[in-house]
């Protein structure tokens, strides 16, 4: 070995100075008698080496690196050898920090593995090999006096937790526990925990189960769930309190917490939930009133709440067939009485014959909002209910009676916009209890079965805005019937458009006769079209070769027109505009030439 490096310290604080010396022995005869020693840190040459010849003939170079800013680097002592740099010796330098105090030390007792698991946060990176040791001792008191030491617990590399096995634990007795961190630059210790392993016990959660329905037990109420939980057997003797959390499976609702609950609920009814809704439920427990850790949340239980019977008002309306008055078409609409009025599975119309106690005859059972049935001759009234698996709504009586009430007057309708119509009236005297408003396409598309209807509960109303099933350019028939206590008034009807269409074509112009200064024109009017408002007038336009325009307005019944004051032998362009309240349309252009002065008139 020709050279040897020695350093003040191979491991230093990051950024600290480091001093190194390199000695080259005299007997390295192949070297230059006065060799120049060079220093290299990593790949970079380092200036500042002070070289001297010692009394024994050896050469020494000393260098001080003012700041070691590499966490790891090789320092080399070199000589120029020919054209290359010859490394005589090198040392590894390391720089970093002493270990910070480990913090957030916490432990929990696992009764299944019978061990105390402690974990901590090691603090910032030291850049140096740092070992952690979990140290502990048994103590009779509050850890002021140290009892038997417990074997050190050394975590696997890179882990920040360690398990103290049962054989080193004393339950119901305090232990002093801390973490020691050590590296080449120093040692640090976490604050000491003083704990009884049982006070940090973490239990397993109970298992949630649904209640097996028993014949004698009442079914859960709407919006309620019946459940129970099976405690974790190894923790059965530990007093605990538990809490339940639940949320609907659909939607973005957050968990709702219920507690504290006893560990031993043989049966538990959770209420105040949405009816007919699937819920996810979980439970967790903690040793209580003694200290402990919350268990994890249990595996989820998924349950559906029972539904509630429909809570709706059923608005009804009926019509008799003209050819067969005993055949009745009944219509209804469910009006929710509460925010959650229950799902409706279907509807039943039934009749109870008088004198037959308890006998109810169903007339129809449907999921639709109407049904047609034959009304028994002695029946004056039927009952309508909405139902689901939880029961029925309150029955709505429907009384079939003659129209004996007064009629409303001055029924009129007007367009509000292309998709709504306002229907107004003057209420009769006395005030009715309400009105039924029906509307549907007028002739020729009229159909009783395709009518939309609404109940207006306010008998003092003087109008109603129709917003459903209204389209522009369609003629609608609107029927309004006043409703009284046990009867109704005669129905009145009116026709209206929500928006009318401009004429689609103007009539084609034809030349009937022409002269030198006049021309007689005629046309065949377009037949009236449904959805198009009637013509209000025509305007005829004519333009000469000099682009001068003339026009005349004609009434809607006109079938022809004579243009006077034309120039002989002149070219004219003529067109007709048909106009209604909804707009106007032009005909195609007719081009004609008046006769020359010497020509004879054409008829």
């Amino acid at each position: 070995e020709c050279g040897h490096i020695s350093v003040s310290a191979p491991i230093v604080h990051l950024g600290d100075p480091i001093t190194a010396s390199c000695i080259i022995k005299q007997n390295c005869s192949h070297l230059d008698p006065e060799p120049q020693i060079l220093w290299r840190l990593g790949a970079e040459l380092q200036p500042g080496g002070r070289q001297q010849r010692l009394s024994d003939g050896t050469q020494e170079s000393i260098i001080t690196l003012p700041h070691l800013n590499h966490t790891q680097a090789f320092l080399s002592c070199c000589l120029n050898w020919g054209n290359s740099l010859q490394i005589l010796d090198q040392v590894e330098l390391r720089a970093g920090y002493p270990p910070a105090i480990p913090h957030n030390l916490s432990c929990l007792m696992n009764l299944t593995t019978s061990s105390l698991i402690c974990q901590w946060e090691p603090g910032p990176e030291t850049h140096l090999p740092t070992s952690f040791t979990l140290k502990s001792f048994k103590s009779r008191g509050n850890c002021q006096t140290q009892g038997d030491s417990i074997l050190d617990c050394v975590p696997k590399d890179g882990q920040s937790h360690c398990c103290i096995p049962r054989k080193h634990l004393l339950l119901y007795q305090n232990m002093g526990i801390w973490v020691q961190a050590e590296n080449a630059l120093g040692t640090s210790m976490s604050p000491q925990l003083c704990l009884d392993p049982m006070d940090v016990v973490k239990l397993e959660p109970p298992m949630l189960r649904t209640m097996d329905p028993s014949p004698e037990a009442a079914p859960p109420q709407a919006g309620c769930l019946q459940l129970c939980w099976e405690p974790w057997q190894p923790g059965l003797h530990i007093n605990q309190k538990c809490e339940l959390r639940h949320k609907p499976q659909r939607g973005e609702a957050s968990w709702a917490l219920v507690g504290p609950l006893p560990l031993e609920a043989l049966q538990y009814e959770l209420c105040g939930l949405l009816p007919a809704t699937a819920y996810t439920l979980q439970i967790r427990c903690i040793r209580w009133p003694l200290p402990g850790h919350w268990s994890d949340w249990s595996p989820s239980l998924e349950l559906r709440t029972t539904e509630r019977a429909p809570t709706v008002r059923l608005d009804t309306w009926w019509r008799q067939r003209q050819l067969d008055p005993r055949t009745v078409q009944l219509f209804w609409k469910p009006v929710p009485l509460e925010e959650d009025s229950g799902r409706i599975q279907g509807y039943v119309v039934s009749w109870r014959p008088s004198g037959q106690a308890g006998a109810i005859l169903p007339l129809c059972n449907t999921t639709e909002l109407s049904c047609t049935f034959h009304l028994p001759s002695e029946a004056q009234e039927v009952a309508l209910v909405a139902y689901n698996s939880a029961g029925t709504s309150r029955p709505t009586p429907v009384v079939f009676s003659e129209s004996r009430g007064p009629a409303l007057t001055r029924l009129h309708a007007m367009a509000r916009d292309p998709h709504s119509l306002w229907v107004g009236w003057e209420p009769p005297n006395p005030w009715p209890q309400g009105y039924v408003i029906e509307w549907g396409l007028g002739p020729p598309s009229a159909s009783n079965s395709n009518k939309t209807w609404r109940m207006e509960q306010n008998g003092r109303a003087t109008g109603f805005l129709l917003k459903e099933n209204i389209r522009p350019f369609q003629l609608y028939e609107i029927i309004v019937t006043p409703l009284y206590q046990d009867t109704m008034g005669p129905s009145q009807h009116v026709y209206a458009y929500s928006q009318e269409m401009a004429p689609s074509h103007a009539p084609e112009l034809h030349l009937k006769h022409i002269g030198k200064t006049w021309a007689q024109l005629e046309w065949v009017p377009e037949p009236p079209e449904l959805g198009k408002s009637p013509l209000t007038h025509y305007t005829i336009f004519w333009t000469n070769a000099q682009n001068q325009s003339f026009s005349a307005i004609l009434n809607a019944s006109s079938r022809g027109f004579v243009l006077h004051g034309l120039e002989p032998a002149s070219l004219y362009h003529i067109h007709l505009m048909a106009a209604s309240q909804a707009g106007a349309t032009n005909s195609t252009v007719l081009t004609l030439m008046t006769l020359t002065p010497e020509g004879s008139e054409l008829h």
């Epitope: 009764l111 049962r166 057997q233 003797h237």
Partner: antibody
Framework: EVQLLESGGGLVQPGGSLRLSCAAS????????MGWVRQAPGKGLEWVSS????????PYADSVKGRFTISRDNSKNTLYLQMNSLRAEDTAVYYC???????????WGQGTLVTVSS | DIQMTQSPSSLSASVGDRVTITCRAS??????LNWYQQKPGKAPKLLIY???NLQNGVPSRFSGSGSGTDFTLTISSLQPEDFATYYC?????????FGGGTKVEIK
């Protein structure tokens, strides 16, 4: 100091009934599970029944299920064992025990002898 | 049900002897194993709970070990007052079964 004192034992005919009591003192009775263990003459220990701190959970040994009922009155710090339809094989010393958090019987009464014989 | 098998059923030993009694569970019981001592005409007394925890007031010559299915009670130096019957018991689940007992007699 924990003390458990059993009473109610005695001679009873087969098919008869007895009610054992266990008066507890020296600890917060309402926080602990309690239990009954019996020992037939010259035999080993046999667990009979336990009851949770609130009385909601009551497991039984198969040999007594349906005949014996365990109960407690936390206001009186007393544990009970109602024994019906007694059989000769129920003859034993009945011990009342205080249970620890890990199920161990940490304290025992002195026992009361039940003899079922005609 | 978890069955508990104790061995030996009886043993003879002298004062100062080291005595070992074993208890085997028919299935894993973690550390939920308790040891009791009973002297004739007396109530049982808890010695060890949760496999290795010494009950308050019990001399340190008694120790327990094991986990899962195999457990041991050791008396490091038998004393005259230790001659009695010893029972193991599992407490991980109901029914809480006891072992058949081991009678320690004077040689």
């Amino acid at each position: 100091e924990v003390q458990l004192l059993e009473s109610g034992g005695g001679l009873v005919q087969p098919g008869g009934s007895l009610r054992l009591s266990c008066a507890a003192s020296g600890f917060t009775f309402s926080l602990y599970w309690m239990g009954w263990v019996r020992q037939a003459p010259g035999k080993g220990l046999e667990w009979v029944s336990s009851i949770s701190s609130s009385g909601g959970v009551t497991p039984y040994a198969d040999s007594v299920k349906g005949r014996f009922t365990i109960s407690r009155d936390n206001s009186k710090n007393t544990l009970y064992l109602q024994m019906n339809s007694l059989r000769a094989e129920d003859t034993a010393v009945y011990y009342c025990a205080k249970l620890g958090e890990l199920g161990q019987s940490s304290a025992w009464g002195q026992g009361t002898l039940v003899t079922v014989s005609s | 049900d978890i069955q508990m098998t104790q061995s030996p059923s009886s043993l003879s030993a002298s004062v100062g002897d080291r005595v070992t009694i074993t208890c085997r569970a028919s299935q894993g019981i973690s550390s939920y194993l308790n040891w009791y001592q009973q002297k004739p005409g007396k109530a049982p007394k808890l010695l060890i709970y949760y496999a290795s925890n010494l009950q308050n007031g019990v001399p340190s010559r008694f120790s327990g070990s094991g986990s899962g299915t195999d457990f041991t009670l050791t008396i490091s130096s038998l004393q005259p007052e230790d001659f009695a019957t010893y029972y193991c018991q599992q407490s991980i689940q109901y029914p809480q079964m006891f072992g058949g007992g081991t009678k320690v007699e004077i040689k």
